[in-house]
């Protein structure tokens, strides 16, 4: 079952997600998507990192933590009721089926 996080309309929501890089800057690709984690990748991707940097995001979605040290927690700016739902943080470790998947439930009040 998903861990639940709450935010108020008009505020910023924070969805935590972390991993430990082998070394600072030795990054593992991460994707964030709206909806539960599918078998592979993320559905409805809102933000993505690669081995080097944050390489894709859409307006309102950003990383407030030190992603190069494994803090890939998602900030959603100025949330509305439509932002309620499940979000997937998927840490894409190398190798088959090695991904770490986290489903986080965002409740907007």
């Amino acid at each position: 079952s998903e861990v639940e996080y709450r935010a108020e309309v008009g505020q910023n929501a924070y969805l935590p997600c972390f991993y430990t890089p082998a070394a600072p800057g030795n990054l593992v690709p991460v994707c964030w998507g709206k909806g539960a984690c599918p078998v592979f990748e993320c559905g409805n991707v809102v933000l993505r990192t690669d081995e080097r940097d944050v390489n894709y995001w859409t307006s309102r979605y950003w990383l407030n933590g030190d992603f190069r040290k494994g803090d890939v927690s998602l900030t959603i700016e100025n949330v509305t009721l439509a932002d309620s739902g499940i979000y997937c943080c998927r840490i894409q470790f190398p190798g088959l089926m090695n991904d770490k998947k986290f489903n986080l439930k965002l409740v907007i009040k």
Epitope: P24, G25, R52, D53, V54, W57, T58, S59, R60, W62, L63, N64, G65, D66, F67, R68, K69, E77, N78
Partner: antibody, heavy 121, light 107 residues
């Protein structure tokens, strides 16, 4: 292609106000912050701060609090730098530069051509 | 604020030389260090990010190294078009300070 186009040179007197524009094209304006950088004649680069283009929230470096204001016209994909009560030491070239919104991503990958401001009585 | 110190202030080189520009931070900034080139009467251009990551469109003769507080920008074989001022930038802590620059001249 991505471009940041700034307004033209300005000649002002001390005490006056100037507003410099930076018009973005080639990308979704609200997905990147906009930074402002000052370069005094013959000197180096100094970050003034940046503005979140989605929320409009500005962040100012300590040396640029008070007389300086960042603003937006999102519908025109434009950012603005206003300097009030101009002083001679404001004479400089001002650059806008694109910055990703993420807290630890602070390189500036695209720059405007610069706007030269001369303040002289 | 983090102080970024660059050396030397001016470097006079011959085309074909390999050159190294130094940048030192007043405290550790991990690898949050970016390099820019500014040619006369032009805007700065991003050369290297995160101390050593290459940027699309930048010639491969430019490379960066370092971590913590000591960083180096290397130009493998200097060309006449490389003249300009090179700035390092602290990308770790606001206000993301720049170094004073190293001016590269051709003899």
């Amino acid at each position: 292609q991505i471009q940041l186009v700034q307004s033209g040179p300005e000649l002002k007197k001390p005490g006056e106000t100037v507003k410099i524009s930076c018009k973005a094209s080639g990308y979704t304006f609200t997905t990147y912050g906009m930074s402002w950088v000052k370069q005094a004649p013959g000197k180096g680069l100094k970050l003034m701060g940046w503005i979140n283009t989605y929320s409009g929230a500005p962040t100012y470096a300590d040396d640029f609090k008070g007389r300086f204001a960042f603003s937006l016209e999102t519908s025109a994909s434009a950012a603005y730098l206003q300097i009030n009560n101009l002083k001679n030491e404001d004479t400089a070239t001002y650059f806008c530069a694109r910055k990703p919104p993420h807290y630890y991503v602070n390189s500036f990958d695209y720059w405007g051509q610069g706007t030269t401001l001369t303040v002289s009585s | 604020d983090i102080v970024m110190t660059q050396s030397p202030a001016t470097l006079s080189v011959t085309p074909g030389d390999r050159v190294s520009l130094s940048c030192r931070a007043s405290q550790s900034i991990s690898d949050y260090l970016h390099w820019y080139q500014q040619k006369s009467h032009e805007s700065p251009r991003l050369l290297i990010k995160y101390a050593s990551q290459s940027i699309s469109g930048i010639p491969s003769r430019f490379s960066g190294s370092g971590s913590g507080s000591d960083f180096t920008l290397s130009i493998n074989s200097v060309e006449p078009e490389d003249v300009g001022v090179y700035y390092c930038q602290n990308g770790h802590s606001f206000p993301y300070t720049f170094g004073g620059g190293t001016k590269l001249e051709i003899k």
